[in-house]
């Protein structure tokens, strides 16, 4: 392993079509990839009028987006299906939504809003 | 090596039924999904359905619901595809197929195909 | 069920040329869009997963993007070995279903 680097061999599993895929609603699921490879974990949820529903969770794979966050948190403004990824083991227990904000100008010294956490 | 092989080509009557294995090597099975792939000639990719072994219950593509049956067999890491009053429609080439992950990103190992030809 | 439309259906092109393939879904399968490549006789082979990750061993010419409905796969600097038929895949709601294929043919 790479120092510094969180290996991530497992990642909490969910799926919410789980009657419709006949697999289990929730559970581990260990995370296989090339050895050259990175492993990540994920989560994708909706927001249906404020309300959290969370739609997978599982593994994800050696994707340049997912490298070196330790938390899981979607940056997107808006979108219609959140995603976030993340390294190390379960770290999709825990997601959060955290929109990056156009830069602009700030007419005073700007504050960072703590982001909201999902689990 | 990772790979997936299966059985060999089959020659089956209209109204019988078809049972192809695939045996799997180099990677754990029983927490790997399984997904079974078939491709008519000259024709396009159809999903027909897959398991997780240790969950043990299969998913089924609607149109296939009743007349396929997918199995494994954990101690041999053999996967099985089981289609019924079989038609001239079934003719086709039938893959089976790891997946990446339970979430189905995508199908990375591909056995090396099993034709199934259905005539009278 | 998610229906995937490809464009174009085939499509002739020179070595070192760069192609673009689009994949359009009926419903937003979100990231859960892959790209497989086949060549006659053989079983198909994923290049992309997750709509831009690459899979193992696949040279970094293929690229893949989009998000929502609207996906593309870009081969730049087109080699003699690419010369084949890609399909598109959503595997985000059962059941999964295919893209009817684009054959790239050699100019």
């Known amino acids: 392993a790479i120092l510094g680097r969180s290996e991530t061999q497992e990642c909490l599993f969910f799926n919410a079509n789980w009657e419709k895929d006949r697999t289990n609603q929730t559970g581990v699921e260990p995370c296989y990839g090339d050895k050259d490879k990175r492993r990540h974990c994920f989560a994708t949820w909706k927001n249906i009028s404020g309300s959290i529903e969370i739609v997978k969770q599982g593994c994800w794979l050696d994707d340049i987006n997912c490298y070196d966050r330790t938390d899981c948190v979607e940056k997107k403004d808006s979108p219609e299906v959140y995603f976030c990824c993340c390294e190390g083991n379960m770290c999709n227990e825990k997601f959060s939504y955290f929109p990056e904000m156009e830069v602009t100008q700030p007419t005073s010294n700007p504050v960072t809003p703590k982001p909201p956490y999902y689990n | 090596q990772v790979q997936l092989v299966q059985s060999g080509a089959e020659v089956k009557k209209p109204g019988s039924s078809v049972k192809v294995s695939c045996k799997a090597s180099?990677?754990?099975?029983?927490?790997?999904?399984i997904s079974w792939v078939r491709q008519a000639p000259g024709q396009g990719l159809e999903w027909m359905g897959g398991?997780?072994?240790?969950?043990?219950?299969?998913n089924y593509a609607q149109k296939f619901q009743g007349r396929v049956t997918i199995t494994a067999d954990e101690s041999t890491s053999t996967a099985y595809m089981e289609l019924s009053s079989l038609r001239s429609e079934d003719t086709a080439v039938y893959y089976c197929?790891?997946?990446?992950?339970?979430?189905?990103?995508?199908?990375?190992?591909w056995g090396q195909g099993t034709m199934v030809t259905v005539s009278s | 069920e998610i229906v995937m439309t490809q464009s174009p259906s085939s499509l002739s092109a020179s070595v070192g040329d760069t192609v673009t393939i689009t994949c359009r879904a009926s419903q937003g399968p979100s990231r859960w869009l892959a790209w497989y490549q086949q060549k006659p006789g053989k079983a198909p082979r994923l290049l992309i997963y997750?709509?831009?990750p690459l899979s193992s061993g696949v040279p970094s010419r293929f690229s893949g993007s989009g998000s929502g409905t609207h996906f593309t796969l870009t081969i730049s600097s087109l080699q003699p070995e690419d010369f084949a038929t890609y399909f598109c895949q959503q595997s985000y709601s059962t059941p999964f279903t295919f893209g009817p294929g684009t054959k790239l043919e050699i100019k």
């Open positions: 197929v790891k997946d990446l992950t339970w979430t189905n990103l995508g199908l990375d190992i």
């Open positions: 180099g990677f754990q099975f029983r927490t790997s999904l």
């Open positions: 398991l997780i072994p240790i969950f043990g219950t299969a």
């Open positions: 997750g709509a831009s």
